[in-house]
Amino acid sequence: APTSSSTSSSTAEAQQQQQQQQQQQQHLEQLLMDLQELLSRMENYRNLKLPRMLTFKFYLPKQATELKDLQCLEDELGPLRHVLDLTQSKSFQLEDAENFISNIRVTVVKLKGSDNTFECQFDDESATVVDFLRRWIAFCQSIISTSPQ
C-alpha cells in the first residue's frame, strides 16, 4: 500500500503539473491576444499602411504542431519588427511596436523554453505579414483547443 508520504508527493506533482498547464494556457492566450491585436491594427489601417507592409516576405514552418515549433515564430520577430516600424505615425507609435515584439518574444520563450538548439524547418514559400500572423493565430488556437482544461 502506498505510504502517506508517497501519496502526498504524487499529489504535489499532479498539482504542479496542473499549475504548469494553467500557466502554459495563460501564455498561449496572451500570445494569441498579442498576435490578434497586431493583425487587427494592420487591418484597421489597411489602405494607409498595408500596401507597404505587404511588400515584406515572411517564412512559415513546414509543419507546426508543437510548442517547440514556436522557435520559427521567434526567428521571424526581427522582420516583424521592421514591418511594425512602418506603422508608426498615426496608427501605431514606435514604442508601442517595440513593446509588442518584446512581449511576444518573452511569451514565446516561456512557451518553447530557452533552449535554442531546435532548428526551424521553414517552408520554401513566402507569406505576407497578414498570412503570417493568421497562421500563427491558428497555431495558438489549435494548441489551446487541444490542451487539457
Epitope: R46, N47, L48, L50, P51, R52, M53, L54, T55, F56, K57, P79, H82, V83, D85, L86, S89, K90, S126, T128, V130, D131
Partner: antibody
Framework: QVQLVQSGAEVKKPGESLKISCKGS????????IGWVRQMPGKGLEWMGI????????RYSPSFQGQVTISADKSISTAYLQWSSLKASDTAMYYC???????????????????WGQGTTVTVSS | SYELTQPPSVSVSPGQTARITCSGD??????AYWYQQKSGQAPVLVIY???KRPSGIPERFSGSSSGTMATLTISGAQVEDEADYYC???????????FGGGTKVTVL
C-alpha cells in the same frame, strides 16, 4: 472605370516653376496611394515619391527629396508634382500611378502601381 | 541608396523562352514586381508578389524568386512581347520604391 488623367505637355525655361497634375476618377481617391515616376528620354523608370491623399502622408526617393514637391487636393481628387526652379535635366516624361490594394474575401493582394496616367511631357530648354 | 540590377538586353527567338533576372540585396525579404513597357506607352504590371499574374496577363509570363534574385520568364515568347521590362521592389525599410534599370527584350 478607374483612371488617372494627367495635365498636358509643358515647355518651360530653366529657373521657371511648374506644377503638373493627375486627376483620379472611378474610385475613392483618398483611399489609395499615388506615386510619381520619371522617365528621361531613352532611359528607364525612376520612382520619385508617393502620397496618400487621405492624410497627405508623403514619401520621397532620396534622389528627389528637396528637388520636387508632391501634394494632393482631395476635394478635387487631384495629385500634383511641382518644381520651384526647373533645370534642363528635368526634361522627361512624368507618370502618375495608383497603388492598388485589393481585398478578396479575407485575403489581401497588393498589386504595386497598376493604374497609370498617360504621362506628361516636360521640356526645359532655354 | 538601394539598387536593383538587371541585364540591359535579352534576345530570344519566337516560341523560345526568355529569362530576365533582377538582383537586389533585400529581395530575400522583399517581393518583386515586374512591369512591361512598350515603346511610347505607359508601363503595365505583369507580375506581382514575385510570381502572381494579374488578370488579363497571358500565362506565358511567370515569375519566381530565390535568395537575392528575382526572375521573370516568358515561355514561348511572341513578337508582341518585345518591350522593356522593369523589376520593382522596396528598399529594406519598405518606405522607398526602386525600379531596376530595365531590360530590353528583343524577339528576333
Amino acid at each position: 472605370q478607374v483612371q488617372l488623367v494627367q495635365s498636358g505637355a509643358e515647355v518651360k525655361k530653366p529657373g521657371e516653376s511648374l506644377k503638373i497634375s493627375c486627376k483620379g476618377s472611378g474610385y475613392s481617391f483618398t483611399s489609395y496611394w499615388i506615386g510619381w515616376v520619371r522617365q528621361m528620354p531613352g532611359k528607364g523608370l525612376e520612382w520619385m515619391g508617393i502620397i496618400y491623399p487621405g492624410d497627405s502622408d508623403t514619401r520621397y526617393s532620396p534622389s528627389f527629396q528637396g528637388q520636387v514637391t508632391i501634394s494632393a487636393d482631395k476635394s478635387i481628387s487631384t495629385a500634383y508634382l511641382q518644381w520651384s526652379s526647373l533645370k534642363a535635366s528635368d526634361t522627361a516624361m512624368y507618370y502618375c500611378a495608383r497603388e492598388t490594394l485589393a481585398a478578396v474575401g479575407s485575403n489581401y493582394y497588393y498589386y504595386g502601381m497598376d493604374v497609370w496616367g498617360q504621362g506628361t511631357t516636360v521640356t526645359v530648354s532655354s | 541608396s538601394y539598387e536593383l540590377t538587371q541585364p540591359p538586353s535579352v534576345s530570344v527567338s519566337p516560341g523560345q523562352t526568355a529569362r530576365i533576372t533582377c538582383s537586389g540585396d533585400a529581395l530575400p525579404r522583399k517581393y518583386a514586381y515586374w512591369y512591361q513597357q512598350k515603346s511610347g506607352q505607359a508601363p503595365v504590371l505583369v507580375i506581382y508578389e514575385d510570381s502572381k499574374r494579374p488578370s488579363g496577363i497571358p500565362e506565358r509570363f511567370s515569375g519566381s524568386s530565390s535568395g537575392t534574385m528575382a526572375t521573370l520568364t516568358i515561355s514561348g515568347a511572341q513578337v508582341e512581347d518585345e518591350a522593356d521590362y522593369y523589376c520593382y521592389s522596396t528598399d529594406r525599410s519598405g518606405n522607398f520604391w526602386v525600379f531596376g534599370g530595365g531590360t530590353k527584350v528583343t524577339v528576333l
